[in-house]
């Protein structure tokens, strides 16, 4: 059974950094591209980033480009999101997800809340 | 970036009645593989999103056949033939044809009392 579990969220001051993790199990992690998607409180979904199955290719939303870095460790079946220069508008629940675009099933974690506040 | 515009933003529907949500993209969503990558998601209250439809009209396994997707180019529609209580939530379209991927603002489906 596919399982995605995010962790690392919390309260952080503006300008500071935070690293989110997503532990994957129940599937061949090394064969799948992985995404981060966020949702600000009471707001809609915003796609954040994708990383290719082997970590060779990454794309980001303009709002996080240059501040956030998506990475993965296939030996640990773990996806990461390194967030720096955090702003109040980065406050959101962050979800890791698999197969947003293609395939017959998509998978999402339960989300981890990041609050950027002084 | 490709702008995705959904309408309406709020949709009150009577149980058993049909519902229709529109999604317009600022650019064609035909990808280099020849497919149109327009995806629909449902997010029920307090839950993570889940994909309902991919490539405009392909239903994800396990999604009831009352959900259907249609459209081409820049105009797309999600239809629910007979709304049920469990369909309450927010519906989002997503384009997966151009970087960065972008979501629509969401359409909140509510049941009319």
């Amino acid at each position: 059974q596919v399982h995605l579990v995010e962790s690392g969220g919390g309260v952080v001051q503006p300008g500071r950094s935070l690293r989110l993790s997503c532990a994957a199990s129940g599937f061949k992690f090394r064969s799948y591209g992985m995404h981060w998607v966020r949702q600000a409180p009471g707001k809609g979904l915003e796609w954040v980033a994708i990383i290719w199955y082997d970590g060779s290719k990454r794309y980001y939303a303009d709002s996080v480009k240059g501040r956030f870095t998506i990475s993965r460790d296939n030996s640990k079946n773990t996806l990461y999101l390194q967030m720096s220069s955090l702003r109040a508008e980065d406050t959101a629940v962050y979800y890791c997800a698999r197969d947003l675009i293609t395939g017959t099933t998509d998978y999402w974690g339960q989300g981890t809340l990041v609050t950027v506040s002084s | 970036d490709v702008v995705m515009t959904q309408s309406p933003l709020s949709l009150p529907v009577t149980l058993g009645q049909p519902a229709s949500i529109s999604c317009r993209s600022s650019r064609s969503l035909v990808y280099s593989d020849g497919n149109t990558h327009l995806i629909w998601f449902q997010q029920r209250p307090g839950q993570s999103p889940r994909r309902l439809i991919y490539r405009v009209s392909n239903r994800v396994s396990g999604v009831p056949d009352r959900f259907s997707g249609s459209g081409s180019g820049t105009d797309f529609t999600l239809k629910i033939s007979r709304v049920e209580a469990e369909d309450v939530g927010v519906y989002y379209c997503l384009q997966g044809a151009h970087w960065p991927y972008t979501f629509g603002q969401g359409t909140k489906l509510e049941i009319k009392r």
Partner: antibody, heavy 123, light 111 residues
């Protein structure tokens, strides 16, 4: 236009070595995983090796593991297959192929192939 | 290793008719609801050409008369209506599990 040109094949004695090359053009080479597939004289297709787009990961079937090495030079847009301890059963047409992009996923489907280079292992 | 058995080994079909090629896997090639089965066409003196990926997805530029279906261990390639240029050998390939294996091929002749 995507183009893959295989070279380096030839006649080699059992136990010998050979290095195949595949020159790629018409696409961003560093964005794609690449594979080698061979076709035996009986027309049977066999997957030989795969290398991920960045070159971080390599995969082989047991039949060539430890004898063959796949590598790539993204600056030169070139894929390689170093073959060692060659056996008569390695005689085949060797094709380099591009792995189909799957929105970040590894699909294992090969969407473009070179014209092939023939390898004959014989004493 | 997963063994792929194609049938028939050869078939002759009249122009405009349907050609159906079967590929049976010795174990399931599905993963998370996705069928990791691909289909290729090979003409004499040419390399293989991808037709269908992930069981049912038509590769870009391939005519819609080609279609793939199936799941688990049973997969099918259909060509309808068959045209003269479809005379070739067709191979299935699974990419669910290392080593990625091919079927033995099906030779299609046009009557």
């Amino acid at each position: 236009d995507v183009k893959l040109v295989d070279s380096g094949g030839g006649l080699v004695k059992p136990g010998g070595s050979l290095k195949l090359s595949c020159a790629a053009s018409g696409f961003t080479f560093s964005n794609y995983g690449m594979s080698w597939v061979r076709q035996t004289p009986e027309k049977r297709l066999e997957w030989v090796a795969t290398i991920s787009s960045g070159g971080y990961y390599t995969y082989y079937p047991d039949s060539v593991k430890g004898r063959f090495t796949i590598s790539r030079d993204n600056a030169k847009n070139t894929l390689y297959l170093q073959m060692g301890s060659l056996k008569s059963e390695d005689t085949a047409m060797y094709y380099c192929s591009r792995d189909r992009e799957g929105f970040g996923n590894y699909l294992g489907a090969m969407d473009y192939w070179g014209q092939g280079t023939s390898v004959t292992v014989s004493s | 290793d997963i063994v792929l058995t194609q049938s028939p080994a050869s078939l002759a079909v009249s122009l405009g008719q349907r050609a159906t090629i079967s590929c049976k896997a010795s174990q399931s090639v599905d993963y998370d609801g996705n069928g990791y089965m691909n289909w290729y066409q090979q003409k004499p003196g040419q390399p293989p050409k991808l037709l269908i990926y992930a069981a049912s997805n038509l590769e870009s530029g391939i005519p819609a008369r080609f279609s793939g279906s199936g799941s688990g261990t049973d997969f099918t390639l259909n060509i309808h209506p068959v045209e003269e240029e479809d005379a070739a050998t067709y191979y299935c390939q699974q990419s669910n599990e290392d080593p990625y294996t091919f079927g033995g091929g099906t030779k299609l002749e046009i009557k």
